[in-house]
């Protein structure tokens, strides 16, 4: 009886694992083995596929074959008993195009209100992704074990920290990788769960802001308690992208080590041009807080995001404010080629009650003022880019008196 060639051959490639599966053509014939050959592009001869010779099952692994993953290959299979079937040729394919990204490795660390997620490619030193290691991004799904309500977080790198969680609560998550340059989305990792700790005695510092004053950066934050000391650390932001490296060498800012105030001032030349992460920690001598949320700090934007300059035209019931480009030393205007939004704060000189206006325009009306009253105004600029949410410091306050009644024209 003639042996029929196997059918429906499937090639599954996950990371560096090459698996072939096929269907037997004739289940009634026993003791059949199967063998594969392969052929590279531009070659006439077929070569025996190691790992896939005389196979009794309907699955084989040819991961040991050192292929150029960007080169097209062709496979063929036949059944063997006393005689052999005809060859069945599989459509040619390029391994890299066919490959799926496997589940990443996930390592979790818990704090009281945060979880640190360290993500590594599932296959260490993968041949398939050798040229794409730094291009991996990850996305995750996280949920409270008790509720199951899922939150998705996209476009994260090999280290990510999730804040504003509840203490003593179990959170579960799964992570998948993506290579957006190749339109590849990977498969999810197994689910990992971790319980946040009891609430720490000292909360972390909050609301960290960086501003520029003269040739210095001024770093400010809020803290709940008095009589504390603080330290500030920085890290190059790109280091979070480094696959497989989970030793982050945070560095001290020398002028911000063991400071007793909720701000510190350090020279701009501490940082070369680039994007950094900053974090702050509080200590009372006995206990230490966990680190604050990490803020992104871009020296390019920070250096040029200066407080706006403005003129006031006073009327009886309003101010017209005209915002101009900030001045550098030498009185030359700074060209800011990214969209800004302006925050204007004004108050009656004799009162502390501040009112706020947010405007995209550079001419702003401050309405509902009382005649013959001194009002003070200060303004600052914000970038409109969500990812690099930066703010200038406030300008110096300018105080003006409104005109007498009936001068609204």
């Amino acid at each position: 009886k003639n042996l029929k060639s196997p059918q429906k051959v499937e090639v599954d490639i996950i990371d560096d694992n090459f698996i072939l599966r096929w269907n037997r053509s004739d289940e009634s014939v026993g003791n059949v083995t199967f063998s594969f050959d392969y052929q590279k592009t531009g070659m006439d001869n077929w070569i025996k596929l190691s790992g896939c010779q005389n196979i009794t099952s309907t699955k084989c692994n040819f991961s040991s074959l050192k292929l150029n993953v960007y080169e097209e290959i062709k496979l063929r299979i036949r059944a063997e008993k006393e005689n052999t079937s005809s060859w069945y040729e599989v459509d040619s394919f390029t391994p890299f195009r066919k490959a799926q990204i496997g589940p990443p490795e996930v390592h979790l660390e818990a704090e009281d209100k945060a979880i640190v997620i360290h993500i590594s490619p599932g296959t260490k030193d993968s041949v398939m992704w050798a040229l794409d290691g730094l291009s991996f991004t990850y996305s995750l799904v996280i949920w409270k074990n008790s509720s199951g309500v899922e939150e998705r977080i996209e476009n994260i790198y090999s280290r990510h920290k999730i804040y504003k969680l509840s203490p003593e609560t179990t959170y579960c998550l799964k992570v998948k990788a993506a290579l957006l340059t190749s339109w590849k989305i990977g498969v999810y990792s197994p689910v990992h769960c971790i319980k946040t700790t009891v609430e720490n005695e000292l909360p972390p510092p909050e609301n960290i802001e960086v501003s520029v004053q003269n040739q210095n950066y001024v770093l400010k934050w809020d803290y709940t308690y008095a009589n504390m000391t603080f330290q500030v650390q920085w890290l190059h932001a790109f280091l979070k992208r480094n696959p497989g490296n989970h030793l982050y060498k945070w560095k001290q800012i020398p002028d911000c080590e063991n400071v007793k105030t909720t701000q510190c001032v350090f020279p701009q030349n501490v940082f070369q041009k680039g994007i950094y992460l900053l974090r702050v920690q509080a200590s009372d001598g006995n206990n230490t807080s966990f680190w604050s949320e990490e803020i992104k700090f871009d020296t390019e934007i920070q250096a040029f995001l200066l407080p706006p300059v403005f003129n006031i035209r006073s009327l009886s019931d309003s101010f017209h404010i005209y915002i101009g480009a900030p001045k550098q030393s030498g009185n030359t205007p700074v060209i800011q080629d990214y969209p800004l939004i302006y925050e204007i704060i004004f108050w009656e000189n004799t009162s502390n009650a501040e009112r706020k206006i947010i405007e995209k325009k550079t001419d702003v009306t401050v309405p509902n003022l009382k005649p013959l009253t001194v009002y003070c105004v200060k303004a600052r600029a914000h970038t409109m880019d969500e990812k690099l949410n930066k703010s200038s410091v406030f300008s110096d306050a300018v105080c003006e008196k409104t005109k007498p009644g009936n001068t609204s024209k």
Epitope: L108, E109, H246, L247, Q252, T288
Partner: antibody
Framework: QVQLVQSGAEVVKPGASVKVSCKGS????????MHWVRQAPGQGLEWIGR????????KYAPKFQGRVTMTADTSTSTVYMELSSLRSEDTAVYYC???????????WGQGTLVTVSS | DIQLTQSPSFLSASVGDRVTITCKAS??????VVWYQQKPGKAPKLLIY???YRVSGVPSRFSGSGSGTEFTLTISSLQPEDFATYYC?????????FGQGTKLEIK
């Protein structure tokens, strides 16, 4: 494979200094922290400090501040720990250890016995 | 400095026993705790990191758990080669600190 090889045992007089070396192989020391830990005879482990060989930044335990100096020579993949003003209670085995992923001391040297005796 | 207190300091047990060693921190250290095994005349050997992650090559009978201030190392079924001294260590803040050790002896 990763290996840390330390210098040989030392006998030093009280008040003197000792400098212990630790040579790494099988990895690039600039990518890691290098820690020093000591263990007095029959006692537990005590962290002395660590150095980042990439930029020579150090962190010392307050107990050793002012007496310890850690240095690194990346060209020979070697780190050094010098302890000065030695007293008898500094008699211990001194270990170097690599600080790897997740800030863990994952590989250790074989230890160097330093005996302080007059 | 963060103090770590291990208990018990000495433990006698037999091959096949299940043993648990605890480590208490003087303040919240998250899950930043590491466990080492040390045999006489040898350097410490890393067993568990980040409270519960077993190092590759360490037998599955070793497990770690806990967070915040209380941590445990469990050996599910003691083997002859497990008799040694065990140390916990916190890596949450400098200076790193160790527990005083737990000496596990054959009963």
């Amino acid at each position: 494979q990763v290996q840390l090889v330390q210098s040989g045992a030392e006998v030093v007089k009280p008040g003197a200094s000792v400098k212990v070396s630790c040579k790494g192989s099988g990895f690039n020391i600039k990518d890691y922290y290098m820690h020093w830990v000591r263990q007095a005879p029959g006692q537990g482990l005590e962290w002395i400090g660590r150095i980042d060989p990439e930029d020579a930044e150090t962190k010392y335990a307050p107990k050793f501040q002012g007496r310890v100096t850690m240095t690194a020579d990346t060209s020979t993949s070697t780190v050094y720990m010098e302890l000065s003003s030695l007293r008898s209670e500094d008699t211990a085995v001194y270990y170097c250890a690599r600080g790897g992923n997740f800030y863990v001391m994952d590989y250790w040297g074989q230890g160097t016995l330093v005996t302080v005796s007059s | 400095d963060i103090q770590l207190t291990q208990s018990p300091s000495f433990l006698s047990a037999s091959v096949g026993d299940r043993v648990t060693i605890t480590c208490k921190a003087s303040q919240n250290v998250g899950t930043n705790v590491v466990w080492y095994q040390q045999k006489p005349g040898k350097a410490p050997k890393l067993l568990i990191y980040s409270a519960s992650y077993r190092v590759s090559g360490v037998p599955s009978r070793f497990s770690g758990s806990g967070s915040g201030t209380e941590f445990t190392l469990t050996i599910s079924s003691l083997q002859p080669e497990d008799f040694a001294t065990y140390y916990c260590q916190q890596k949450n803040n400098y200076p790193y600190t160790f527990g005083q050790g737990t000496k596990l002896e054959i009963k």
